[in-house]
């Protein structure tokens, strides 16, 4: 089938295009090219007769067309008007006609665009700005760049007019940027020069520096004012409402107390028409003033908050000092001083940080102290304690429990029995109790300021019979001559007598034995290995008695000075040397041997077969107890004689 291919399809103005013919039939008489999608004599471009090789221009011929023998048509120096369809009409020798249509599009080389703006000096938070990319060009795509980046997504940015117009609503100072537009068509892309958006803003509230407001008589006062503003603000100073000067800085040398007052800086933007003022109160002291402490947090929460204490007033060229609890500041990673020592920061306050705190200002002659400041640290509640500590009660008595938890402000208390709320009091009182009053008694403490709650649960048993007691110990493996051991008979019961037995005997009289806590606690001071015995406690009241199981005290001791056996020190050559070392110790010690100072083996027994005089020397046994951390040793001299020279010598093992 006859087809036409346009090379290229998108043609730049001024270039050329080839309408290339594919599948041209054979045995042709001639062919003609027409502008448009059909054969129209008025729109013929050129005709070609093969027999004569004669090309004949038609009405639509422009002088820029060249026809080739293969029927392809080259159009040079393309103009915009050339866009469209082209039809090839082929006449075969049998006078049967065939047609094919091709097309191409002509695009101009785009001109360099420029940006026009409807507002060259928009005012922040008030004006909108519309940028338009010029000129308007047919079949062109428009793009925008801000600071060489594609447009950010923002509800204040809007594209319209086929993306040719970029509108910024409610401009802000951050819209001050470089804006460029780009135009594209299939054959070229162009970019404008950048336009810088000049947003008028401010003035913002001015800042007066330096920040210090307290001065000494005789100093120079040098205040500077600055307000963010475009164009830059014009400044005026007022003292106590009276205009002084139109400068950014105010300088008054050698000030006196009379220069105290309110200092106002007024910033004015002539383009936006806005004014903003800031007032600072300057105090000039004849003498250094009495300092005082300000705090950024009057009720800090323990382990949560930091507190910054600042010594006021701020005075230039002054030394600030601090005291806590009438002492100079302790070294602590939680205490931080600012560079000028004026601010003391307590990181992660605790209940012990209440103070009092004092600051001082040092002058030439003395130090002026502030009044003390006490911190009100909110803490707790800690785990509540329920008293008394009895857990067993007899029927018929009164049960009176009191709850207390360290807390600031003081905790609010609630009592629950077996999970059921009883009352919101610190004390719980039940008269004439019975077995039915046995159960889990919970005290809940709540701190309304910190919002924290803590609970403690106590099991109360009401029974005529006393339970079987048990012994608790504060040290399961005491070291001899070093540790003390406290045995406590559990549980604590009301109106109960506590008794103790050692190895089935009543307690011996000894200054190292002490009973306390109503005989409920037995303390052994400076335990010895002889205290390793069976201890039993008993409880009794008017209706019952009971004894605990025995608890044997495991006293760690030793090692004592070791003994080497046999005791012989002289041996005959050829005998076997078999030395055994023993030291009293709990737990058993580790043994090691040295001969003439040289380490040998880590065994209790040292064996050397067929000794010779070469085995003469000092034999040392070393013992160590890892549990007590103690060591000991003994040295024995061994002499080996040649056979038969020393009668009466041991023959060895």
């Amino acid at each position: 089938k006859l087809t036409i291919e346009s090379t290229p399809f998108n043609v730049a103005e001024g270039k050329e295009v080839l309408l290339l013919v594919h599948n041209l039939p054979q045995h042709l008489f001639g062919y003609s090219w027409y502008k448009g999608e059909r054969v129209d004599g008025n729109r013929q471009i050129i005709g070609y007769v093969i027999g004569t090789q004669q090309a004949t221009p038609g009405p639509a011929y422009s002088g820029r067309e060249i026809i080739y023998p293969n029927a392809s048509l080259l159009i040079q120096n393309i103009i915009q008007n050339d866009t469209g369809f082209y039809t090839l009409h082929v006449i075969k020798s049998d006078l049967v006609n065939e047609e094919a249509t091709g097309q191409f599009r002509v695009y101009p080389e785009l001109p360099k665009p420029s940006i026009s703006s409807n507002n060259s000096k928009p005012v922040e938070d008030k004006d909108a700005v519309a940028f338009t990319c010029e000129p308007e060009t047919q079949d062109a795509t428009y793009l925008w760049w801000v600071n060489n980046q594609s447009l950010p997504v923002s509800p204040r940015l809007q594209l319209s007019n086929g993306n040719r117009t970029l509108t910024l609503f409610n401009v802000t100072r951050n819209d001050t940027a470089s804006y460029k537009c780009e135009t594209q068509n299939p054959v070229s892309a162009r970019r404008s020069d950048s336009v810088i958006l000049n947003v008028l803003y401010g003035p913002d509230a001015p800042t007066i520096s330096p920040l210090n407001t307290s001065y000494r008589s005789g100093e120079n006062l040098n205040l500077s004012c600055h307000a963010a503003s475009n164009p830059p603000a014009q400044y005026s100073w007022f003292v106590n409402g009276t205009f002084q000067q139109s400068t950014q800085e105010l300088f008054i040398p050698n000030i006196t107390v009379n220069n105290s007052g309110s200092y106002t800086c007024q910033a004015h933007n002539s383009d936006t028409g806005l004014n903003r003022t800031t007032v600072t109160t300057i105090t000039v002291y004849a003498e250094p003033p009495k300092p005082f402490i300000t705090s950024n947090n009057s009720n800090p929460v323990e382990d949560e908050d930091a507190v910054a204490l600042t010594c006021e007033p701020e005075i230039q060229n002054t030394t600030y000092l601090w005291w806590v609890n009438n002492q100079s500041l302790p070294v602590s990673p939680r205490l931080q001083l600012s560079n000028d020592n004026r601010t003391l920061t307590l990181l992660s306050v605790t209940r012990n940080d209440v103070g009092p705190y004092e600051c001082g200002i040092q002058n030439e002659l003395s130090v002026d102290h502030s009044d003390p400041v006490i911190l009100n640290v909110l803490y707790g509640p800690d785990d509540p304690t329920i008293s008394p500590s009895y857990t067993y009660y007899r029927p018929g008595v009164n049960l009176s429990l009191s709850c207390h938890a360290a807390s600031n402000p003081p905790a609010q208390y609630s009592w629950l029995i077996d999970g059921n709320i009883q009352q919101h009091t610190q004390e719980l009182f039940i008269s004439n109790i019975t077995e039915k009053n046995s159960g889990l008694y919970t005290c809940q403490a709540n701190n309304s300021a910190s919002g924290h709650s803590r609970t403690t649960v106590k099991t109360i048993t009401v029974s005529a019979e006393l339970p079987k007691p048990s012994i608790s110990s504060n040290n399961s493996k005491p070291v001899e001559d070093k540790d003390a051991v406290a045995f406590t008979c559990e549980p604590e019961a009301q109106n109960t007598t506590y008794l103790w037995w050692v190895n089935g005997q009543s307690l011996p009289v000894s200054p190292r034995l002490q009973l306390s806590n109503g005989n409920r606690t037995l303390t052994l001071f400076n335990v010895t290995r002889n205290d390793a015995r069976a201890y039993v406690c008993g409880i009794q009241n008017s209706v019952s008695a009971n004894r605990s199981d025995p608890v044997t005290l495991d006293v760690l001791y030793g090692p004592d000075t070791p003994i080497i056996s046999p005791p012989d020190s002289s041996y005959l050559s050829g005998a076997n040397l078999n030395l055994s070392c023993h030291s009293a110790s709990n737990p058993s010690p580790q043994y090691s041997w040295r001969i003439n100072g040289i380490p040998q083996q880590h065994t209790q027994v040292l064996f050397i077969a067929k000794i010779t005089p070469n085995n003469n020397g000092t034999y040392a046994c070393f013992v160590s107890n890892l549990a007590t951390g103690r060591n000991n040793s003994i040295v024995k001299s061994i002499t080996v004689s040649a056979s038969g020279t020393s009668p009466g010598l041991s023959a060895g093992a």
């Epitope: 730049a12 270039k15 360099k112 760049w145 060489n148 070229s188 892309a189 162009r190 970019r191």
Partner: nanobody
């Protein structure tokens, strides 16, 4: 102003591939549109491909369309030309060109040019 240095040229057999690079320095790379041009011995300088500032627009000469791909890496200040299915008629000195305001096939639109890198397609 921007300086351009081409590399990656060489001798390759017909049907083979090459990747040309153009390294830019001296100015913000993303401020420039870029193009590749070539000049065969005894012939006029010919447009090959162009790419705009952001890389979203490309334009190719008909003779290379479908075989060559132009791309840019603004982060590394480099322009590329991936050339596949090379033909003997692709033999030429390949130039990289830059313009702050024009991307297209017209060499007069590009004020900045590199020294070129030679591509030879031969069996």
């Amino acid at each position: 102003e921007v300086q351009l240095v081409e590399s990656g040229g060489g001798v390759v057999q017909p049907g083979g591939s090459l990747r040309l690079s153009c390294a830019a320095s001296g100015h913000t790379f993303s401020e420039y549109a870029l193009g590749w041009f070539r000049q065969a011995p005894g012939k006029e300088r010919e447009f090959v491909a162009a790419i705009n500032w952001g890389g979203g627009w490309t334009y190719y000469a008909d003779s290379v369309k479908g075989r060559f791909t132009i791309s840019r890496d603004n982060a590394h200040n480099t322009l590329y030309l991936q050339m596949n299915s090379l033909r003997p008629e692709d033999t030429a000195l390949y130039y990289c060109a830059a313009s702050s305001d024009y991307a297209g096939g017209n060499p007069t639109g590009y004020p900045y040019w590199g020294q070129g890198t030679l591509v030879t397609v031969s069996s």
